[in-house]
């Protein structure tokens, strides 16, 4: 074979969002007949030469970026896409509210607001879907998520997290659910697909005004000004519905 071996995939099961003290399994998957796997935590000196890492109880310092590769003969593969393992429940849950209220007319505007008692500068909002209700959220630097020109597709259950950019993999417990009801339409609310494309963007300009729209059942972000965004790979495998257990600090 010429050139490097193709990269393996790295998954966190059941999810890459892991409540403190709950189990998670990291699984590196290459082609059949691999001689050796190496799974490593970035920005640390730790690695293991096995394809599966079972974490029986999630801890704060296990959160972070992971990647894996494999060896066949003397050849090493390209590294997998990075997996971002997030510890949730590190901080008390924020509160999620809708302004002017959780019931909104089709065509109207609503803003979802995530509030925390900590001085955190980052927030994550996600919508419960079906059949896998808990999806990787998209992140913004603002606590307010305006939804302009609401449609039936925006109906559903939302939760948010708060966290600090100083420790981007240590998140709060999820907020209590907020049910957004869109009135004046009989269209069935759309669901997120089992594994949406994940154009998760980290925005480097904290003051950018963001408009959240859910077009074609996929989370997207739009902004009215030029901001720097770097797309990241999706790090949540498709799978059965995920149960989240939350724990305050």
């Amino acid at each position: 074979q010429s050139g490097p071996l193709p990269k393996p995939s790295l998954q966190a099961l059941p999810s890459s969002l892991v409540p403190l003290e709950k189990p998670v399994t990291l699984r590196c998957q290459g082609p059949p007949g691999v001689d050796l796997y190496r799974l490593e935590k970035l920005s640390s000196s730790r690695y293991q030469d096995q394809a599966v890492l079972f974490i029986p109880a999630m801890k704060r310092s296990l959160a972070g970026r992971y990647r894996c590769s494999y060896q066949n003969g003397s050849l090493w593969s390209l590294p997998s896409d990075q997996l971002e393992l997030v510890a949730t429940g590190v901080f008390a849950k924020p509160s999620l509210s809708a302004q002017p209220g959780p019931a909104v007319s089709s065509g109207g505007d609503v803003t979802l607001q995530c509030q925390t008692r900590y001085g955190f500068d980052q927030f994550a909002l996600y919508k419960e879907g079906d059949p896998a209700p808990y999806k990787n959220p998209e992140r913004w630097y603002r606590a307010s998520f305006p939804i302009i020109t609401v449609t039936a597709a925006h109906s559903g259950t939302y939760r948010c997290y708060s966290f600090s950019s100083r420790d981007p993999y240590l998140w709060s417990a999820p907020s209590d659910p907020l049910e957004l009801v869109v009135t004046g339409t009989s269209v069935t609310p759309s669901r997120l697909p089992t594994e949406p494309p994940s154009p998760v963007a980290e925005f480097s300009e904290a003051t950018a005004e963001l408009t959240v729209s859910f077009t074609n059942e996929v989370f997207t972000t739009e902004t009215s000004r030029s901001i720097t965004a770097s797309p990241k790979e999706s790090d949540s495998p498709a799978g059965p519905a995920r149960q989240y257990y939350t724990k305050g600090n």
């Epitope: 293991q48 029986p56 704060r60 100083r166």
Partner: antibody, heavy 116, light 96 residues
Framework: EVKLQESGGGLVQPGRSLKLSCTAS????????MSWVRQAPTRGLEWVAS????????YWRDSVKGRFTISRDNAKSALYLQMDSLRSEDTATYFC?????????WGQGVMVAVSS | LLSASVGDRVTLNCTAS??????LAWYQQKLGEAPRLLLY??NSQTGIPSRFSGSGSGPDFTLTISSLQPEDVASYFC????????FGAGTKLELK
């Protein structure tokens, strides 16, 4: 070479305060959780407190909660332990250590004696 | 306290009060020095001499020194980090 150097120990009366410092070198300090561990002849090794790499999350053993505060300054590669309302049972050698779960590097330790 | 001779195979045991999976570390501490990490995750080495090895999972763990050397005289501690973070009382190893 990884080095951790504690300072700030000494003899103090019960109820008084003391601040320990730990200066780190030889590794990227901001990448690692850091902890304080203490050792007393009567009680052996005891984990005291840990702080996340960015400093947003910190936590303590129950017996020091509300009295001790762990903090860090990544720009200075420094770790601190502010100890207030000291008690005789806090008498021990205090070690600065790298990590949260297991501790792969330790300082040489600094003695704290609480006595009237 | 454990006494052994140079060249002996020495086994130290550590039993946790519950299943801690492989969340266990072993440390060596020589007199007047700080502890030194020998093994983490029950059996993962940290650049120590190959005569040190670890085994076990659940509540029962073992640290083995395959051939005792004079410089191995020290106290040895196990530490679990599955539920909180606690150290064993330690075993002092001396030469016969």
């Amino acid at each position: 070479e990884v080095k951790l150097q504690e300072s700030g120990g000494g003899l103090v009366q019960p109820g008084r305060s003391l601040k320990l410092s730990c200066t780190a070198s030889g590794f990227t300090f901001s990448d690692y959780f850091m902890s304080w561990v203490r050792q007393a002849p009567t009680r052996g090794l005891e984990w005291v407190a840990s702080i996340s790499s960015g400093g947003a999350s910190a936590y303590w053993r129950d017996s020091v909660k509300g009295r001790f505060t762990i903090s860090r300054d990544n720009a200075k590669s420094a770790l601190y332990l502010q100890m207030d309302s000291l008690r005789s049972e806090d008498t021990a050698t205090y070690f600065c250590a790298r990590g949260e779960l297991d501790f792969d590097y330790w300082g040489q330790g600094v003695m704290v004696a609480v006595s009237s | 306290l454990l006494s052994a001779s140079v060249g002996d195979r020495v086994t130290l045991n550590c039993t946790a009060s519950q299943n801690v999976y492989k969340n266990l570390a072993w440390y060596q501490q020589k007199l007047g020095e700080a502890p030194r990490l020998l093994l983490y995750s029950a059996n993962s080495q940290t650049g120590i001499p190959s005569r040190f090895s670890g085994s076990g999972s659940g509540p029962d763990f073992t640290l083995t020194i395959s051939s005792l050397q004079p410089e191995d005289v020290a106290s040895y501690f196990c530490q679990q980090y599955y539920s909180g973070n606690t150290f064993g009382a330690g075993t002092k190893l001396e030469l016969k």
